[in-house]
Interface confidence: low
């Protein structure tokens, strides 16, 4: 089976405050089985932004239908962006288990927030 790659094509994304940010993430293999999660930051500081199996995440929506078995697009949209949302976002594949364990991370996308246009 093909080795899983996690592709975050955008090194950086800039969004005006109040707008939505789309953070792209695609995977190249359905294996290993397990959820994709999005985090902001790294290390102990990292904040969970989206998890297929948890929720709700009121400001986060998936761009495609992530519940479809063959889906490989795990891009997300975050609404009503504020300066507090700035940071680097990582799309991370977990291997199914008890508990799920981290398998591979994307390279990250840095989100910067511009002042709201007056």
């Amino acid at each position: 089976e093909e080795e899983l790659q996690i592709i975050q094509p955008d090194k950086s994304v800039s969004v005006a405050a109040g707008e939505s940010a789309i953070l792209h993430c695609t995977i190249t293999s359905l294996f290993p089985v397990g959820p994709i999660q999005w985090f902001r930051g790294a290390g102990p500081a990292r904040v969970l932004i989206y998890n297929q199996r948890q929720g709700p995440f009121p400001r986060v929506t998936t761009v495609s239908e992530t519940t479809k078995r063959e889906n490989m697009d795990f891009s997300i949209s975050i609404s009503n962006i504020t300066p507090a949302d700035a940071g680097t976002y990582y799309c991370i594949k977990f291997r199914k288990g008890s508990p799920d364990t981290e398998f591979k991370s994307g390279a990250g996308t840095e989100l910067s927030v511009r002042a709201k246009p007056s």
Partner: antibody, heavy 117, light 108 residues
Framework: DVQLVESGGGLVQPGGSLRLSCTAS????????MSWVRQAPGEGLEWVSA???????YYTDSVKGRFTISRDNSKNTLYLQMNSLRAEDTAIYYC???????????WGLGTLVTVSS | EIVLTQSPGTLSVSPGERVTLTCRAS??????IAWYQQKPGQAPRLLIY???SRATGIPGRFSGSGSGTEFTLTITSLQSEDFAVYYC??????????FGGGTKVEIK
Amino acid sequence: DVQLVESGGGLVQPGGSLRLSCTASGFTFRNYGMSWVRQAPGEGLEWVSASSGSGSTYYTDSVKGRFTISRDNSKNTLYLQMNSLRAEDTAIYYCAKVTWNNFFDYWGLGTLVTVSS
Amino acid sequence: EIVLTQSPGTLSVSPGERVTLTCRASQGIAGKIAWYQQKPGQAPRLLIYDASSRATGIPGRFSGSGSGTEFTLTITSLQSEDFAVYYCQQHYDWSPLTFGGGTKVEIK
């Protein structure tokens, strides 16, 4: 309001064990990293251990292999299992919420651990 | 490990004075410095993060600045409730996170 309440401190002999708990409220616990920071009597602050929201764990070198951090997101509780305790582990142990960029925005009042024979 | 050195160790000042505390890092930390205030018998309180951003509810007399390896915390017109120990912490490298040794600001 964010609240962090530590418990489980006390007097223990060298080589003994203790389990500290930190109960959190006022925020979505599972989404945030949590940490233990200690302060020996009359000394400064020392980061001990941290757990990311998803359960990844981190330790300072002096406690690796002796201390284990864990969390129960269903109970909004952070734990620190401390084994093979030494006199130099004597300190107030603070539970702290790790914010988005590795600093601590909320702290508990601390629980005192005394290791002495 | 990133070592943070705070100076001076103790500062004796009078209310109303301006105070500047220094924190030096052993290597560049990209402005990732936080400052905390700790009063006797209390937990630390976050004052400043990212070198210059004030935490929620922190009065405007507290300000942070600096870049590279040298950072300062300034308190303009020191109030009686500001007498405390101040710690810097680098939040650049989490393996491990490190604090400075602290600066005690005491009444002259």
